[in-house]
Structures are given as C-alpha cells and as structure tokens.
C-alpha cells in the first residue's frame, strides 16, 4: 500500500486547512491509527492528533479545539484532519503516520502554506503570499513617500528661487551705486574666503553642493553657527555673497530659512553709508521682529 497526500496544502488566512492523508492499501489491509505531527526543521515533532479506528480522535492539548475529523460519512482509510482557523504560525511541515494491519507503518509529509487575500471576494487565483503582499505594501508606501518628497523639494525650490530673485532685484537696485566701493573695502579689510569676488567663490548662485572646490567652502552648507556671519554690522557685499551662496539648490535647513528671513527684515531697518550698514533712526531705537523677539 501507499499513502496519498499533497506536497503542499495552501489555505487562506483564517480558513480551515484540510491536511490530507489517505491510505491506498492492498486487499485485506486495515488502518489501525493515524498520527499527525508538526515536524518543522530544527524542532522536535509536536503531536497534533491521533486518529484511532476504534477510539476515535484524540487531539493534543496544544491544538485542543482546532483539530477535527471530516464529518461522516467518512472513508475508513481517510486519515485526513482539519486544522481550524489557520494562522500564519501554522505554516510549516506536517507529517502523517499511518499504522496498518498487516502491512505495518507508513508516513508522508506535506507543507502547509497560509495565504493572505487582498480582497476576500477574489478567487484563489488572486491570492498572494503574505510576504509578497508585505513587500508590495512597503514598496507602494515607499514610492508614495518618495513622490511626496520630490513634490515638496520642487515646491520649496521654486519658492526659494522666487524669493531669492525678489531679494536680488531689490538689493541690486539699492546697491548699484555702492557696489564697487563695497568690493574695495572688502578686499582691504577682510581675508575671509567667503568675501571674495563671485569668480573665486566655490559655490555660485546657480551652483550645487557638488561644485564645491574644496572642503573649506563646506562651512557654507553646515548648520554650525560659525559657518556664517549674520552680524547686522557686516558689509553689504558680505550679505550679498551669503545670499548667493544660500540660493536654491544648496539644501538649506529650516533654521537657515529663518535667518534668511531675518536678513530681509533687518535690511528694512538699516541704511547704507560708505559701504557699511547703519541702523535707521526710529522712535525708540528698538526693533521687534515678526516673532516678537527683541533685536
């Protein structure tokens, strides 16, 4: 005789799994008992149930209430059992051992696979493996997040480009008369590489971080306070250069945007005299910025 089973039994999450084990015997042979066990690699066999021709079904405590025989009429040679309400943890190898008289013992193994279905109304052809479903879901979420990021970056860059253009136009108008004078003063009073003419600065208005010529210019990109000087008593050219360095594409952080906004607001409260900025005279000499902080 021989045992008939399936190599793989596939069941949908939450459904009952039929674990088939049918003894195809020779004339006069009888099935005495069928023992079912879980036999996952690396672990000892865990008994599920014992099906006795005379005493019926005995289910092990670990599977109490979850293992049943098919209802009658039953073929006496059918050692199949039902595993109720299959969960992911049930996935694995199972073995059925059939004791027959007089032929002796037979055993066969099968693998139980538990599937998750995206839509319970869909037929089994549309069922997908839980792992595959997880991968797909993660992939979709990642793709959506990436698209969102791209949209945010594009919108931000457009916004900053517009802002920078407005600032540049405004400054260009105000500073045209003093530009040459400012540059001369810068050369005579500063050695900071950030105050060099445009041609010698590693990162231009339209440049990207990749175009930095040496690491010394990276301080422009850093978030460390010493990376920039935003003193209100700095030169016009220095402000102008910093504006160019922090133009769209340079990857500014939120903190930097706030400082940028601060510059714009501050400019309204200073006048240019001989290439330097001096505070405009006001009623009380105190300037309160948009956030209500004293400057």
């Amino acid at each position: 005789g021989e045992l008939e089973t399936s190599d793989v039994v596939t069941v949908v999450l939450g459904q009952d799994a039929k674990l088939p084990c049918f003894y195809r015997g020779d004339s006069g042979e009888q099935v005495g008992q069928v023992a079912w066990a879980r036999v996952d690699a690396g672990e000892g066999a865990q008994e599920l149930a014992l099906l006795h021709s005379k005493y019926g079904l005995h289910v092990s405590p670990a599977y109490e209430g979850r293992v049943e025989q098919p209802p009658p009429p039953r073929n006496p040679l059918d050692g199949s059992v039902l595993l109720r309400n299959a969960v992911q943890a049930d996935e694995g190898e199972y073995e059925c051992r059939v004791s027959t008289f007089p032929a002796g013992s037979f055993q066969a193994r099968l693998r139980l696979r538990v599937l998750v279905v995206l839509d319970p109304q869909e037929d089994s052809g549309k069922q997908v493996d839980l792992v595959s479903a997880s991968v797909v879901v993660v992939g979709v979420i990642a793709a959506l997040l990436f698209c969102l990021l791209v949209v945010v970056v594009v919108l931000m860059s457009r916004y900053h480009r517009r802002k920078a253009q407005q600032m540049t136009q405004k400054y260009e108008e105000e500073l045209t008369l003093t530009r040459e004078n400012s540059i001369r003063r810068l050369h005579s009073h500063h050695t900071d590489p950030r105050s060099q003419p445009e041609e010698s600065v590693g990162l231009r208005a339209e440049g990207h971080p990749d175009s930095l010529k040496d690491n010394s210019s990276c301080s422009v990109m850093s978030e460390e306070p010493e990376g920039r000087s935003y003193s209100t008593l700095t030169t016009v050219r220095e402000i102008e250069t910093q504006t160019e360095l922090l133009s769209p594409g340079s990857g500014r952080a939120e903190e930097e945007e706030d400082q940028d906004e601060g510059i714009k607001q501050a400019m309204n409260h200073f006048v240019q005299e001989n290439g330097t900025l001096r505070a405009k005279p006001t009623g009380n000499g105190i300037y309160i910025n948009g956030r209500g902080h004293l400057v």
């Epitope: 008939e4 039929k18 049918f22 020779d26 004339s27 009888q30 009429p73 073929n75 006496p76 059918d78």
Partner: antibody, heavy 118, light 107 residues
C-alpha cells in the same frame, strides 16, 4: 481495464423492490469501495449511498429506511436493493467505483434504466 | 439543510472560447469536491477531484479551483467534445449532494 457492469430489471411495480447487481473487473472490492447514484428523467444526479472496501456502508438519510447495499468480494459484485418503490423512483441507477482520493467516482457503470409503473 | 448551488444552469459558447462554471456550497467543504461531465445518453465521467486535481486522462484545458464555499471549473479553448452537462459534487457531510448541473451548448 476497470469496468462496472450492471444488471437488473427495467420495470418495477409500485411498492415492489428494486435489485441491481454491479459486477466489477480490473480492481478489487477489497481495495476500492462503490457508490450508488440515480438520475431521474430530465433531472440531475442524486447520491444514494456508498459501500466502503471494508464492507461498512453510509446512506443518504432520505433513503436509509428502504435502502441496502452489500457486496461479495470473491465474486467482485456489489448488490443494491431499494424497497417500496413509487413512480417518482423512476430513474437511471448507476454504480460507480470510488476513485483514488477515496471519495470521488472515477469509473461508472452503464446505468440501469428503471421505470416504476403498474 | 446543506445546499449546493451550481451556476449557470445553461451556457452557450463557441468552439475556442473559455467558459467557467461555478459551484457554491452552504458551508465550508474543505476542497472535498469533484466535477463530472455527462454527455447525452451516457454515464458521467470524473474530471476533477479534491477541487483542483485533474483525473487521469482529462485534458489540461480543464482546471478546477476554489476553496471554502466557492469552487469553479474552467474550460479553456472549448472543443466540440466538451459540450454536455457538468455537475459538481461535494463529499463533506451526508448526503453527498450534486449540484443542479450546467448544460453547455454550442452557440
């Protein structure tokens, strides 16, 4: 080659019994059991009962009180007997071998057409 | 009472077409289901058992699928010899009822 040959009357008087013999070849009745099924004129199939290879039987509850299925392994014969036939028992009666799965019917007899009439 | 509902009751199709016949049961039958084909004046023939397993000698254009309470028989690229009546039968709890049948006719 598996074969199932049926023999029995084609006409039965109302309230009388119907007996059909199914003689099998190509397999042993100690290895495979047999089903009995009927088909009323212009209608579908109706399962009546089964005899397992060990000799135990299961019947459709609707026919249990008047149905008997037995067999003789040595003669390779299965016997079907239904009592108290009425006009609505007029049908083609089939015997069929249990298949490899232990339940489905993988080989069928030629059928016995039975008319219940006086 | 246990119900087996087969649909459609009749179906017209042309040679080469693909058709699907469905069988619904009133409770989970755990793949204990078979499909049969019967031609006029002949005995039924087993096509599929255990819901998905093709019986010996059955062409591969036939396929069974489903689980739980819903099962189907699909016939790809219909051939002239495929026309006839198809039945499903469950082997769950007694009685082992057949579906009402689906008559497949040539269009």
């Amino acid at each position: 080659q598996v074969q199932l040959k049926q023999s029995g009357p084609n006409l039965v008087q109302p309230s009388q019994s119907l007996s059909i013999t199914c003689t099998v070849s190509g397999f042993s009745l100690t290895t495979y059991g047999a089903h009995w099924v009927r088909q009323s004129p212009g209608k579908g199939l109706e399962w009546l009962g089964v005899i397992w290879r060990g000799g135990s039987t299961d019947y459709n509850a609707a026919f249990m009180s008047r149905l008997s299925i037995t067999k003789d392994n040595s003669k390779s014969q299965v016997f079907f007997k239904m009592n108290s036939l009425q006009a609505d028992d007029t049908a083609i009666y089939y015997c069929a071998k249990i298949g490899y799965d232990g339940y489905a019917m993988d080989n069928w007899g030629q059928g016995t057409s039975v008319t219940v009439s006086s | 009472d246990f119900q087996v509902t087969q649909s459609p009751a009749s179906l017209s199709a042309s040679v080469g077409e693909t058709v699907t016949i469905t069988c619904r049961t009133s409770e989970n039958i755990h793949n204990y289901l078979a499909w049969y084909q019967q031609k006029q004046g002949k005995s039924p023939q087993l096509l599929v058992y255990n819901a998905k397993t093709l019986a010996d000698g059955v062409p591969s254009r036939f396929s069974g699928s489903g689980s739980g309470t819903q099962y189907s028989l699909k016939i790809n690229s219909l051939q002239p010899e495929d026309f006839g009546t198809y039945y499903c039968q469950h082997f769950w709890s007694s009685p082992w009822t057949f579906g009402g049948g689906t008559k497949l006719e040539i269009k």
